[in-house]
């Protein structure tokens, strides 16, 4: 009879993170009497993944009832595949011995790649926001993906940025691997309702890219433009002095009225009117009684944004 | 000795969901001896949530140690809250009775209302794609928040929207809310890489407002244009016509060519040139030996583009 | 025809040593192990040892270790038991069975046993 | 060692019965089981390997279970051929032992 030998019948089987993948095994006789096992690796550190006769291995079944006297078919299936289980599989069969079985033969093992998605891009901006006609850097990152290659692009509210750089990590082989890309973005006014998007293509995604987004009203400053006018008197002996604080982004701001360089009145913007490319308004006013003044008035409208130095704009107000 | 009164001191309690409520309930008196329970809603109906004699709750803890002898304080935490905790709770004095312990007076109840946050907006298209210049529809979904005040906006490429239609259900009073927006989106020709966004706001997002996008590209439809043209000969008795099928998306697009209204030849267009705006360009040539034809070949190039009714563009080959 | 034929009766005085042999034939007889059972009368079944047929590697009972050897001879496709200094409690019918199992022992071939009797 | 019980150590029966034998393991055996009948004079049969695998040509009627420490043989429907000594054997590991047995007599 011919001696036994051990048919790995596929030199490599590539499965998607979560599947389960079928590794092929089948001896060609049924002696000498004793058990098969499968390993992940070779020589002295390989892994046991299957004992046919003893432990738990929740993860694998056997295609073939294995206590059947006649089994050929040592096939099993892992369930639940993770980048962390590629390797090189071997399907080992042992002799019967004392004290221990005694490895008999191997078959010359399947290689299982593991398709993995990369994780959800997650696209970050500056740590300091920067105002138009600045550059700005957004990096997107995402991991755990594999076989390696990868496509990314960048956008910004749907055209295609070209001033971008992409690392894919590790250089070399790897279960899995990373991606880092930097992309630098010129801000505009009207960026505000502006978004970047990181897309990635992937052979695991079937076509359908993986997206990360990042609002540019994270990464903006627009500093406010200052208009002070005076209004038609309501009443003899007062002025009204209006301060017009416009398309400044974000929020934060407090204004000061200053009559001939000494604070009048501090105020913090709350209601505010918001424009349609994001930016608000806001508008302050000043009552000035006139009759406590004899001579002109220079009335400064001060107002610092979002933390930064203080503008101002100042209107002399002519006492007649 | 005053008789006991049952003091709830905070009429109202608002959680955010996930984190623990409590609920505070004090004795003005030690007598009548008897245990305390706390009940949610009042009536025939009402649901015990903690009895201090007996039963099993594992999401109460008690503030303080019921077991001492002198305690007045009978403030419960409720952990991992969820809307569906929401209601009024009421603190009970029970007296000692046979066979059971009888109510003698309960609190004035206390309104627990849980602010959860949104679900993550889910943005769906249509379920056919339209080509540019036609209007489609976009939702937006979100479920599970509490209070019902919500707004909700709609951003094409960080631009605006203002054709939509909001709804929050239900109308009237919930332990959740759920919101459903349909937004009309006009294509544009350049809208493969653009984006529709949906933007919510609510007061348990600080702020920090929820997005969910659809990408246009699932939406749209941008029909070929076609070309076709004459080369210069390659070699005597043979004549090179291109057809250059430009500007379409998505990819599935096949292509007949006909001599005289006889198919010549059918493909499948496969290696595709990306344009910068997401469409794609593709280019079939036909060689036509001109021996073969005494009189002029009219050559037509038939495109069928995503499974659409198939658009056709002629030449006329002059046989010299 | 598989089967594993036996030695004849054999009658020992205490003291003395008793060989039985198995003949095996109709399989290929490297393939498989040969454990030898014994039965005393009136009694259940006591496995008494292993061996090997491929490699000649052995495993036997504590209470019999010194005093039991197998051996096989591939040539004959013949094991063999060897007990050594019997005792009137070794009188038994000897079973040698062939043991099939791949990844635990069972037998599905059976002799059909050798009665020894120790006897002064 | 690993200790084998079995019950009942004899059961008395008619034909058309239906049978049942225990077996328990003193620790965990797997499924590394098997089940002999026995007729006076005769070697061992083997009826049942690895818990509840027929053996071939045994019929159908016998059948068995069990993992871990504690396996069962039924008998479906008794014949005058079954009257006989059954023997469980664990062959998890060496050394290999066998239960009492149970002696299945005529009623």
């Known amino acids: 009879e011919d001696e036994l030998q051990v048919i790995q019948p596929e030199k490599s089987v590539s499965v998607a993170a979560g599947e389960s993948a079928t590794l092929c095994c089948a001896m060609t006789s049924l002696i000498p009497v004793g058990p098969i096992m499968w390993f992940r690796g070779a020589g002295a550190g390989r892994e046991l993944i299957y004992n046919q006769k003893e432990g738990h291995f929740p993860r694998v079944t056997t295609v073939s009832e294995l206590t059947k006297r006649n089994n050929l078919d040592f096939s099993i299936s892992i369930s639940n595949i993770t980048p962390a289980d590629a390797g090189t599989y071997y399907c080992v069969k042992f002799r019967k011995g004392s004290p221990d079985d005694v490895e008999f033969k191997s078959g010359a093992g399947t290689e299982l790649s593991v398709r993995a998605k990369p994780s959800a891009p997650v696209v970050s901006g500056p740590a300091v926001r920067a105002t138009p006609e600045h550059t700005v850097s957004f990096t997107c990152e995402s991991h755990g993906f594999s076989p390696r290659d990868i496509t990314l692009k960048w956008f910004k509210n749907g055209n295609e940025l070209s001033d971008f750089q992409t690392n894919v990590d590790p250089a070399g082989d790897s279960v899995s691997y990373s991606i880092h890309s930097t992309a630098r973005v010129v801000l505009t006014r009207g960026d505000v309702h502006s978004q970047v998007i990181c897309e990635m293509a992937h052979i695991t995604l079937q076509g359908d890219p993986l997206r990360g987004t990042a609002n540019l009203s994270e990464a903006i400053r627009v500093p406010p433009t200052l208009e002070v006018t005076q209004q038609p008197m309501r009443a003899e002996n007062q002025a009204n002095v209006t301060c017009q604080v416009s398309n400044f982004y974000p929020r934060g701001l407090q204004l000061t009225w200053l009559e001939n360089g000494n604070v009048s009145r501090t105020e913090t913007a709350s209601t505010l009117i918001e424009n349609k490319d994001g930016t608000y308004n806001w508008m302050s006013w000043l009552l000035v009684n006139t009759c406590a003044h004899r001579d002109d008035v220079v009335l400064t409208c001060q107002v610092e944004h979002d933390g930064q130095q203080a503008v101002s704009k100042s209107y002399a107000l002519e006492i007649s | 000795e005053d008789e006991l009164q049952v003091i709830q001191p905070e009429k109202s309690v608002s959680v955010a969901a996930g984190e623990s409520a409590t609920l505070c309930c004090a004795m003005t008196s030690l007598i009548p001896v008897g245990p305390i329970m706390w009940f949610r809603g009042a009536g025939a109906g009402r649901e015990l949530i903690y009895n201090q004699k007996e039963g099993h709750f594992p999401r109460v803890t008690t503030v303080s140690e019921l077991t001492k002898r002198n305690n007045l304080d009978f403030s419960i935490s409720i952990s991992n809250i969820t809307p569906a905790d929401a209601g009024t709770y009421y603190c009970v004095k029970f007296r000692k009775g046979s066979p059971d312990d009888v109510e003698f007076k309960s609190g004035a109840g206390t309104e627990l209302s849980v602010r959860a946050k949104p679900s993550a907006p889910v943005v769906s298209g249509p379920a056919v794609r339209a080509t540019p210049e036609h209007t489609v529809s976009f939702t937006c979904e979100s479920h599970g928040f509490s209070p019902r005040d919500i707004t909700l906006k709609w951003f094409k490429n960080g631009n605006e929207l203002s054709d939509f239609q909001t709804n929050v259900d239900p109308a009237g009073d919930s332990v959740s809310y759920s919101i459903h927006s349909t937004a009309r989106v006009v294509l544009t020709r350049g809208d493969v890489h653009s984006q529709v966004i949906c933007e919510m706001a609510h007061i348990t997002l600080q702020g920090d407002p929820l997005r969910g996008t659809a990408n246009l590209s699932e939406a749209i439809r941008v029909p070929p244009t076609l070309e076709v043209t004459q080369q210069p000969m390659r070699a005597e008795n043979q004549a090179n016509v291109t057809c250059q099928v430009s500007n379409f998306y998505p990819r599935g697009l096949q292509l007949t060519w006909l001599e005289n209204g006889n198919v010549s030849r059918t493909e499948t267009a496969s290696t595709l040139i990306e344009n910068k705006d997401g469409t794609y360009n593709w280019m079939s040539w036909l060689l036509v030996n001109t021996c073969a034809h005494r009189d002029d070949v009219v050559l037509t190039c038939q495109v069928e583009h995503d499974g659409q009714q198939a658009v056709s563009k002629s030449y006329a080959l002059e046989i010299s | 025809q598989v089967q594993l034929v036996q030695s004849g009766a054999e009658v020992k005085k205490p003291g003395a040593s008793v060989k039985v042999s198995c003949k095996a034939s109709g399989y290929t007889f490297h393939g498989y192990g040969i454990s030898w059972v014994r039965q005393a009368p009136g009694q259940g079944l006591e496995w008494m040892g292993w061996i090997s047929a491929y490699s000649g590697e052995t495993n036997y009972a504590q209470k019999l270790q010194g005093r039991v050897t197998m051996t096989t001879d591939t040539s004959t496709s013949t094991a063999y038991m060897e007990l050594r200094s019997l005792r009137s409690d070794d009188t038994a019918v000897y079973y040698c069975?062939?043991?099939?199992?791949?990844?635990?022992?069972?037998?599905?071939?059976w002799g059909r046993g050798t009665l020894v009797t120790v006897s002064s | 060692d690993i200790q084998m019980t079995q019950s009942p150590s004899s059961v008395s029966a008619s034909v058309g019965d239906r049978v049942t034998i225990t077996c328990r393991a003193s620790?965990?055996?797997?499924?590394?089981l098997a089940w002999y009948q026995q007729k006076p004079g005769k070697a061992p049969k083997l009826l049942i390997y690895a818990a509840s695998n027929l053996q071939s040509g045994v019929p159908s009627r016998f059948s068995g279970s069990g993992s871990g420490t504690d396996f069962t043989l039924t008998i479906s429907s008794l014949q005058p051929e079954d009257f006989a000594t059954y023997y469980c054997?664990?062959?998890?590991?060496?050394?290999?032992?066998f239960g009492g047995g149970t002696k299945v007599e005529i009623k």
């Open positions: 620790q965990g055996i797997s499924s590394w």
């Open positions: 069975a062939r043991e099939a199992g791949s990844s635990w022992y069972d037998f599905d071939l």
């Open positions: 054997q664990q062959g998890a590991s060496f050394p290999i032992t």
